[in-house]
Interface confidence: low
Amino acid sequence: DGCKDIFMKNEILSASQPFAFNCTFPPITSGEVSVTWYKNSSKIPVSKIIQSRIHQDETWILFLPMEWGDSGVYQCVIKGRDSCHRIHVNLTVFEKHWCDTSIGGLPNLSDEYKQILHLGKDDSLTCHLHFPKSCVLGPIKWYKDCNEIKGERFTVLETRLLVSNVSAEDRGNYACQAILTHSGKQYEVLNGITVSITERAGYGGSVPKIIYPKNHSIEVQLGTTLIVDCNVTDTKDNTNLRCWRVNNTLVDDYYDESKRIREGVETHVSFREHNLYTVNITFLEVKMEDYGLPFMCHAGVSTAYIILQLPAPDFRAY
């Protein structure tokens, strides 16, 4: 069928709760493309009817909720004017009774389920909740060893649990819980997180360093394609997220409809003392509205921006 196959990492998921996966693979999904989801090489696409338990929501596949029998390989087919890519995602569903067993015993869990706090520092845990815009998430509650977390040292801030003056006793099994509302129905999302404690502060107290950009402007012609890398160095055990934002919104969300400006796939190089991360931003076509706007690269608490500006007129051309 002429589609190029791309194999994504396995996702290990908990049954009886909502789950969503977004079919994005920049720069493939940056242009005018159609996205269709299939299960286990079926010729019949996943339903787009929002009342269906499993359905496609724009570029997402949404499970409301996920069930044990949903394990399998899902494909999303991205068709552009001159291209076709088939992305394979292996979803493994397990019956998880969070209070009974340790999530640490599970194989190959992603880093979202394993987080690190730094001893004696003010640090944070992140509740990773990835859902389409049709899903409304309520306030997040945090639990440790099945008890709701309370106390002066803990503060809930959006999707993060801020922990001040981390102690050795803060290691253990955490969970973040949120109520998700979709089409008038409510579902509980509960993510288990295994937390370990490290004494390693890393460079400069584990504050990521943005090497590029450096809060500067870039001259670029109207209508051109532009790719800018954000290069970040951070300690190997960091839990910082790296992303591009504009107007304090993720670029992928801000340009969700046009997909004209997209964030790339993060890569990293491992060094003895740290990792060097690269995540790019792609402007498929620079428009007038992009000039003068700060495009921010975020890495943990660090930020740096680029501002696009029109090149100065070249009077030698006259």
């Epitope: 390693r200 502060a201 090497i211 060094f271 003392e273």
Partner: antibody
Framework: EVQLVESGGGLVKPGGSLRLSCAAS????????MHWVRQAPGKGLEWVAL??????????YYSAPVKGRFTISRDDSKSTLYLQMNSLKTEDTAVYYC??????????????????WGQGTLVTVSS | DIVMTQSPSSVSASVGDRVTITCRAS??????LSWYQQKPGKAPKLFIY???NLHTGVPSRFSGSGSGTDFTLTISSLQPEDFATYYC?????????FGQGTKLEIK
């Protein structure tokens, strides 16, 4: 001029203890990672321990043969590196070198190597 | 632990000869390899870092190359003061590990 001067070596019985010191001068000691490397008579070089700088949280690493017996420490105010050696064994007999790590961290510019070495101090563990 | 294997363990050569010493890592160490020269009764001296960078004051007849698992130290034209033992060191990960050394002797 960078100088590293070790002291504290000598003859000790198996099971005994010894504390090595290394006085650093000619550079800003606070900024650098510091190592101990040893060399048994007629043998090759063996890395022993590392202590990172303050900016990196004074993190410590040891080689397997000395872990639990040796303790590396530093006093930045005195520009001095230490190695406390307990439960010494005959196989710990060696010249112990105090070494500066040239690790320079500024974005892309990272170099890992041991750029300056002291003259060494001999530790003999024998009954 | 990463094992560093140097070869040969000893080499006899004459003044003016070109000599190559190799160092092989048991797994990928990128370019995090340095070379040291040690003379009897003296402390080692850094000669090459990051696989190919000459340390300050090291003569240009010394050169280093390689990345990943295979590295070489080359002396283009041996001088009398070059007769010594040479060690490689990986600093990609802890514990840091040295090669067993290559003794360069006068033929």
């Amino acid at each position: 001029e960078v100088q590293l001067v070790e002291s504290g070596g000598g003859l000790v019985k198996p099971g005994g203890s010894l504390r090595l010191s290394c006085a650093a001068s000619g550079f800003d000691f606070t900024d650098y990672y510091m190592h101990w490397v040893r060399q048994a008579p007629g043998k090759g070089l063996e890395w022993v321990a590392l202590i990172r700088n303050k900016a990196a949280g004074y993190t410590i690493y040891y080689s397997a043969p000395v872990k639990g017996r040796f303790t590396i420490s530093r006093d930045d105010s005195k520009s001095t590196l230490y190695l406390q050696m307990n439960s010494l064994k005959t196989e710990d007999t060696a010249v112990y070198y105090c070494v500066r790590d040239m690790t320079i961290y500024d974005g892309y510019y990272v170099d890992y190597a041991l750029d300056y070495w002291g003259q060494g101090t001999l530790v003999t563990v024998s009954s | 632990d990463i094992v560093m294997t140097q070869s040969p363990s000893s080499v006899s050569a004459s003044v003016g000869d070109r000599v190559t010493i190799t160092c092989r890592a048991s797994r990928n160490i990128n370019i995090w390899l340095s070379w040291y020269q040690q003379k009897p009764g003296k402390a080692p001296k850094l000669f090459i870092y990051k696989a190919s960078n000459l340390h300050t004051g090291v003569p240009s007849r010394f050169s280093g190359s390689g990345s990943g698992t295979d590295f070489t130290l080359t002396i283009s034209s041996l001088q009398p003061e070059d007769f010594a033992t040479y060690y490689c060191l990986q600093s990609q990960s802890y514990p840091l590990t040295f090669g067993q050394g290559t003794k360069l002797e006068i033929k």
